[in-house]
Interface confidence: low
């Protein structure tokens, strides 16, 4: 029967006794930077070309004996997971291996850099179709390794990496912390995060998604027909590299941003038991398990968005946190979150010719997060319209005054330390077309976009008494672009998007007490692009 | 605490010293920074990636590497250029004493220097 991991990533319509998805990634070349491999294994024979690249450190210890099968173990298994005949994800993908890890599975940042440079030069000398680079390795945070990954990604290469097996924040490791890399955590057959001895999968905001990574059957280097079960975030990353190869084979023109958004979109949502993660990391860690799309046809009609969390601002009074979208994504909205509830809101601002989302800590606060909603919106023209705090008692308003521009998100930022104590009137972001409305002492920022066929609507869900969490979701066919909270009273910790749901978090009800001012409303802005839908229909 | 770019994990040292007559000060008076792995057992001191500013050409990278070697030799230090990077990042990989970091950070075109460190199969 089909191994659990292949079943897990396969949409129901493809499930049969055998895993046989259409089109096996044959247009794509996958580079593997790992140990040496046994290229003659039946799973990968004829599918993997061993390059002459080798840059590894000496093995530790004078008594270490090189044993070929052990030296090849990690890389052979991963090559099999990506493209193996029977146990592989993308059975049609061709692979090239570079040796950057020694027989003990150890390498160096410099060796990995030189390997990435080798790939770039190969790409320049002999341009081929889409390239996927699998980096099933991790070291401490490295500015230079992250920078090299960024450059290669900007050259059109898709990089997939292991989140790391340290049961820790993936942002402390490289290349896992590189924003341009697709970082993959590991889950098991029960959709639990993988435990590895006393450690386990990494987690946090630098993880893009999870994939099967425990008890994965694949090629063993012990013999050319041997199989073995291995576990780790490397195995998880290999699944995603295979899925990426499949997607790119179906749609070779996909950009990295488009691919990442599709990986997120087609993932299984909210299936991971988050209790395994440290409490402060749960909100930051994506509850997504990778899966193949239900069809090889693209989903070009879909408006894709994802949530990007910033690093924590730190606790100083004027501390800020910044969340950024990828170069070819549009920032459609910006929100903020603070566990202490002490924050001064957020704003969208231009930085280096691109909009970023900046959240502001407040006096006595433990720090804030900025949360960007990053979307794929072709031919978009987006801008931010700001209204300073209003002198009138009613509140501050700002709208999208340009014809054809629609409101995709509202942010508010205030200088007063605790807006909540003022108990002001706070108005809903409706009324005049394309309008954000807010507290009279806050500046209001409207994200206004014009794009072919873009249409948006608002959905609100209000709860009259304080609740720790209020949510509102966009309907099928609509994508959440904006998420904010009304009113801005002191017990609201912030708002953020989880998949297509807007979540507004408040302080523990028991500590705030239930007052008439305690009402909390979650406001979602839901958009869709009829232009993308039309274009997709015309292609088919 | 973490800054907005997520670099809080590294130890960032901005090494300044008296003007070294043999080294040109970096352009615009900016000081290049030194980075090393926050996890001590994974550090590989003695090998450094010298990263040059983005638009630096290969010939400038090679010239900067040679200049470092020459200036180090005048001080009685042996250095070895292990690799010159181009195509992704401009720069070079050098085996040298940590004593030379102050000197290297003042070389023209230098953006930052990172001490090599280990990576592991996951």
């Amino acid at each position: 029967s089909i191994p659990w991991n292949l079943e897990r990533i396969t949409p129901p319509r493809y499930r049969a006794d055998e895993y046989q998805p259409p089109d096996g990634g044959s247009l794509v070349e996958v580079y593997l930077l790992d140990t040496s491999i046994q290229s003659g294994h039946r799973e990968i024979e004829g599918r993997v070309m061993v390059t002459d690249f080798e840059n590894v450190p000496e093995e530790d210890g004078t008594r270490f004996h090189r044993q070929a099968s052990k030296c090849d173990s990690h890389g052979t298994h991963l090559a099999g997971v990506v493209s193996g005949r029977d146990a592989g994800v993308a059975k049609g993908a061709s692979m090239r291996s570079l040796r950057v890890l020694n027989c003990q599975g150890k390498g160096t940042v410099s060796g990995t850099l030189i390997g990435l440079e080798f790939i770039r030069k190969s790409q320049l000398v002999q341009p081929v179709g889409p390239l996927v680079v699998l980096l099933p390795l991790a070291g401490g945070y490295s500015r230079v390794l992250n920078a090299a990954c960024q450059r290669l990604a900007r050259a059109g290469v898709v990089l997939v990496t292991a989140a790391g097996n340290f049961r820790d924040d993936a942002c402390l490791y490289s290349p896992a912390s590189a924003p341009e890399v697709i970082t993959v955590g590991a889950t098991n057959a029960q959709d639990q995060p993988v435990t590895l001895g006393t450690l386990g999968t990494n987690f946090g905001r630098c993880v893009d998604l999870f994939a099967p990574g425990e008890d994965i059957i694949g090629a063993s280097s012990d013999c050319s027909t041997c199989y073995v079960s291995q576990s780790g975030t490397s195995q998880a990353a290999a699944h995603v590299a295979g899925i990426a190869a499949m997607m790119l084979s179906a749609e070779p023109e996909l950009t990295l941003a488009e691919l990442r958004q599709r990986l997120i979109h087609f993932s299984a949502k909210d299936v991971i038991n988050e209790a395994w993660f440290p409490e402060d990391q749960r909100v930051l860690t994506p509850n997504l398990v990778a899966a193949l799309p239900p069809s090889t046809h693209g989903a070009g009609w879909q408006l894709f968005c994802r949530t990007v969390w910033s690093a924590h601002s730190g606790p100083t009074r004027m501390a800020t946190a910044v969340a950024r979208c990828a170069p070819d994504e549009e920032l459609l909205s910006c929100s903020s979150f603070s566990r202490s509830g002490k924050r001064r809101g957020e704003r969208m601002e231009a930085q280096g010719g691109k909009l970023v989302c900046r959240a502001h800590n407040a006096f006595g606060g433990e720090g804030v997060y900025a949360i960007a909603r990053c979307c794929l919106l072709p031919q978009a023209n987006c801008s931010v319209h700001t209204a300073p705090p209003a002198e009138a008692s009613m509140g501050t308003r700002v709208h999208c005054h340009q014809q054809g521009h629609v409101l995709t998100g509202c942010s508010s930022h205030w200088e007063v330390e605790d807006l909540g104590t003022h108990k002001p009137p706070v108005l809903r972001p409706r009324g005049q077309p394309n309008q954000c409305v807010g507290h009279r002492e806050a500046s209001i920022h409207a994200s206004c976009c014009h794009a072919p066929g873009l249409e948006c609507k608002v959905k609100e869900h209000g709860i009259p008494a304080p609740q720790e969490q209020v949510t509102v979701a966009c309907e099928e066919g609509w994508t959440l672009t904006g998420c904010s909270a009304l009113p801005g009273t002191s017990h609201v910790l912030g708002a953020y998007a989880v998949d297509n749901t807007c979540v507004v978090r408040s302080r523990d009800v028991s500590t705030t007490g239930s007052t008439s001012e305690g009402a909390v409303t979650a406001v979602a802005i839901c958009c869709r692009s009829r232009h993308l839908a039309q274009a997709s229909q015309e292609l088919q | 605490q973490e800054d907005e770019d997520g670099d809080y994990e590294e130890l960032v040292l901005a090494l300044r010293s008296e003007e070294d007559g043999l080294a040109e000060a970096p352009e615009h008076g900016t000081t290049a920074t030194f980075h090393r792995c926050a996890k001590d057992p994974w550090r590989l001191p003695g090998t450094y990636v010298v990263v040059l500013k983005e638009e630096t050409h290969l010939s400038q990278s090679e010239r900067t590497a040679r200049r470092l070697q020459a200036q180090a030799a005048r001080r009685g230090y042996l250095t070895k250029i292990l690799h010159v990077f181009h195509g992704l990042l401009p720069g070079f990989l050098v085996k040298m004493s940590g004593d030379l970091l102050e000197l290297a950070l003042k070389l023209p075109h230098v953006d930052y220097i990172e001490e090599d460190s280990s990576v592991f199969a996951q």
Epitope: R428, R430, G431, Q432, N434, E455, C456, K457 | -
Partner: antibody, heavy 121, light 109 residues
Framework: EVQLLESGGGLVQPGGSLRLSCKAS????????MHWVRQAPGKGLEWIGR????????KYNEKFKGKATISRDNSKNTLYLQMNSLRAEDTAVYYC??????????????WGQGTLVTVSS | DIQMTQSPSSLSASVGDRVTITCRAS??????LTWYQQKPGKAPKLLIY???SLQSGVPSRFSGSGSGTDFTLTISSLQPEDFATYYC???????????FGGGTKVEIK
């Protein structure tokens, strides 16, 4: 629950005037534009004008400029329509409607029950 | 000024029938077209906004399509409660005003 309740209709002499009221409840009155629409007996719907209760800004159908005046009292959550120089052809049911904003589109999403104005001697 | 022309002005149909009403604008109104339903003695009720977006609570048998100048309201399977008058409405940019179609009365055959 959003509710709009009109009042002030009735029999009016030709040349006379009247003021219709529309009391809103169940939402933040100042956050939504409000419209007046009328419907003569057996006829279709005809837009009179609208107001932004937040700032009092108004727009009118050319046909009603000088004849209709729309105002509001935010403290009472109430919308008004003042009609002058009434004639027999102004006989109609007058509706107030809230202008719901569906980000990127607009629609009159809640309507009052209507109040009948009859102009006759 | 924009004129909105609805056709037919009335139609007779039976329960279960598929009914199509058209609305034509004298100039391009983009997607800013709304459909309302009105029953005798009652206020109009919002059905569809932005040409094709179904207002929440409206049965899915109602659908709207079109953009620019030609729009359609379709009732896929007419129900007894659907016998009413249907109005289209557009926004006139030049006047900053709102224009209704003449209405289509759907009667029992």
């Amino acid at each position: 629950e959003v509710q709009l309740l009109e009042s002030g209709g009735g029999l009016v002499q030709p040349g006379g005037s009247l003021r219709l009221s529309c009391k809103a409840s169940g939402y933040t009155f100042s956050s939504y534009w409000m419209h007046w629409v009328r419907q003569a007996p057996g006829k279709g719907l005809e837009w009179i004008g609208r107001i932004d209760p937040y700032n009092g800004g108004t727009k009118y159908n050319e046909k009603f400029k000088g004849k209709a005046t729309i105002s509001r009292d935010n403290s009472k959550n109430t919308l008004y329509l003042q009609m002058n120089s009434l004639r027999a052809e102004d006989t109609a049911v007058y509706y107030c409607a809230r202008y719901g904003y569906y980000l990127g589109s607009y629609a009159m999403d809640y309507w009052g029950q209507g109040t009948l104005v009859t102009v006759s001697s | 000024d924009i004129q909105m022309t609805q056709s037919p002005s009335s139609l007779s149909a039976s329960v279960g029938d598929r009914v199509t009403i058209t609305c034509r604008a004298s100039q391009d109104v983009s997607r800013y077209l709304t459909w309302y339903q009105q029953k005798p003695g009652k206020a109009p009720k919002l059905l569809i906004y932005a040409a094709s977006s179904l207002q929440s609570g409206v049965p899915s048998r109602f659908s709207g399509s079109g953009s620019g100048t030609d729009f359609t309201l379709t009732i896929s399977s007419l129900q007894p409660e659907d016998f009413a008058t249907y109005y289209c409405q557009a926004y006139d940019y030049s006047l900053s005003g709102y224009v209704f179609g003449g209405g289509t009365k759907v009667e029992i055959k």
